[in-house]
């Protein structure tokens, strides 16, 4: 949750986290669907993904994605310089060579082909939520989380604490 | 540096009321997640309370609800416990906590305040 | 709610000799493919610190003798070699779901 002021002080925070093992502490694969459950599917569309949010019908399999587990140091926000505890993050690949990646500049969700060691565009602060839910933050613009608009996965702004329970940037991880 | 520090224990009467007060600082306190754990005299430890960043959100344990609320003040960078109908039972230190950067811990831990329950 | 077993009660060491203590949840504690079993270090007078998230991670500033594994519902936690300061009740916990719940400790004294 950030409080406004909090926002401009973890952007530097954030971004200058380090992994702390270029290896993840764990892997898991799952389906990943919205607090309103329509499933985030992707679809190969001339020779690149597209992330859709939709409705399955009855019977349809649910897309999955792996996500890699990382544990990272948090700097301290006061200084800059020092470190205050421990977070997760998390990448995200839905197939074989592809990462979520977050476009800060056009403010969207990407599905990107690139190598290890993977870009800090494709790392996510994991949020623990109630009602079992998680959100995605961006390492790369903290305070920007991953949500939906208009059917599409979008990045979104959280201005405020009260801002990081609104239900477009809260997530469901299932294993079936 | 991260810092907690509880205050408001001390002696009351069963059925009376405590107000219990933790000032953080060292961090962008709206951030976290907040808690409150107690131990009672060579005991173990009890989660007693959560409150989410945002004040969204808060969890009791059974044992309290109806009697303690949590609540917090991020202008003031203070977490509070305001505890009614007080019990022998409730005889404890109390900590407050914060949760790591996401939620999913305890992570930093107050020294404790003493809250006395006794006739 | 989960129930958190610790045993030993008390583990009697030396210095330098290896502590295992053990951790066992009356249901998984996995989720989202993680373990949310923590351990906590608490020395007389003094709050806990944590020493492991998440099964197997070490906090800030934890040293490399200290060291968890386990998943599901069995875990432990493994001092190497013990230095004098180490010598303290270890509990563990689950941050699973709501109540979050601790073990009862392990005292680890000196022999």
């Known amino acids: 949750a950030f409080g406004i002021s909090g926002v401009q002080k973890y952007t530097r925070a954030l971004h200058d986290s380090s992994i702390t093992g270029i290896s993840p502490i764990t892997e898991y694969l799952a389906s990943l669907s919205t607090y309103n459950d329509q499933s985030i599917t992707f679809a190969l569309e001339d020779e690149s993904y597209e992330i859709y949010v939709e409705d399955l019908k009855k019977d349809e399999k649910k897309d999955k994605v792996l996500l890699s587990y990382y544990e990272s140091q948090h700097p301290s926000n006061e200084s800059g310089d020092g470190v205050d505890g421990k977070m997760l993050m998390v990448t995200l690949s839905p197939t074989k060579d592809f990462w979520l990646h977050a476009n800060n500049k056009e403010h969207s969700v990407e599905l990107h082909k690139c190598e290890k060691p993977l870009p800090d565009q494709a790392f996510f602060v994991l949020h623990n939520m109630h009602s079992n839910c998680v959100s995605f933050e961006c390492k790369t613009d903290p305070g920007v989380f991953i949500g939906v608009k208009d059917n599409h996965l979008a990045l979104i702004k959280v201005d405020s604490s009260e801002n990081l329970c609104t239900e477009n940037i809260l997530f469901k991880l299932s294993e079936t | 540096e991260v810092q907690l520090v509880e205050s408001g224990g001390g002696l009351v009467q069963p059925g009376g009321s405590l107000r219990l007060s933790c000032a953080a600082s060292?961090?962008?306190?709206?951030?976290?997640?907040m808690s409150w754990v107690r131990q009672a005299p060579g005991k173990g430890l009890e989660w007693v309370a959560t409150?989410?960043?945002?004040?969204?959100?808060?969890d009791y344990v059974d044992s309290v609800k109806g009697r303690f609320t949590i609540s917090r003040d991020d202008s003031k960078n203070t977490l509070y416990l305001q505890m009614n109908s007080l019990r022998a039972e409730d005889t404890a230190v109390y900590y407050c906590?914060?949760?790591?950067?996401?939620?999913?811990?305890?992570?930093?831990w107050g020294q404790g305040t003493l809250v006395t329950v006794s006739s | 709610e989960i129930v958190l077993t610790q045993s030993p009660a008390t583990l009697s060491l030396s210095p330098g000799e290896r502590a295992t203590l053990s951790c066992r949840a009356s249901?998984?504690?996995?989720?989202?493919?993680?373990?949310?079993l923590n351990w906590f270090q608490q020395k007389p007078g003094q709050p806990p610190r944590l020493l492991i998230f998440a099964a197997s991670n070490r906090g800030s500033g934890i040293p490399a003798r200290f060291s968890g594994s386990g998943s599901g519902t069995d875990f432990t936690l493994t001092i190497s070699s013990l230095e004098p300061e180490d010598f303290a009740v270890y509990f563990c916990?689950?941050?699973?779901?709501?109540?979050?719940?601790f073990g009862q400790g392990t005292k680890v004294e000196i022999k």
């Open positions: 916990q689950q941050s699973k779901e709501v109540p979050f719940t």
């Open positions: 060292g961090f962008t306190f709206s951030s976290f997640s």
């Open positions: 906590t914060r949760a790591n950067y996401g939620n999913w811990f305890f992570e930093v």
């Open positions: 249901e998984s504690v996995a989720k989202y493919g993680l373990s949310l």
């Open positions: 409150i989410s960043g945002g004040k969204t959100f808060t």
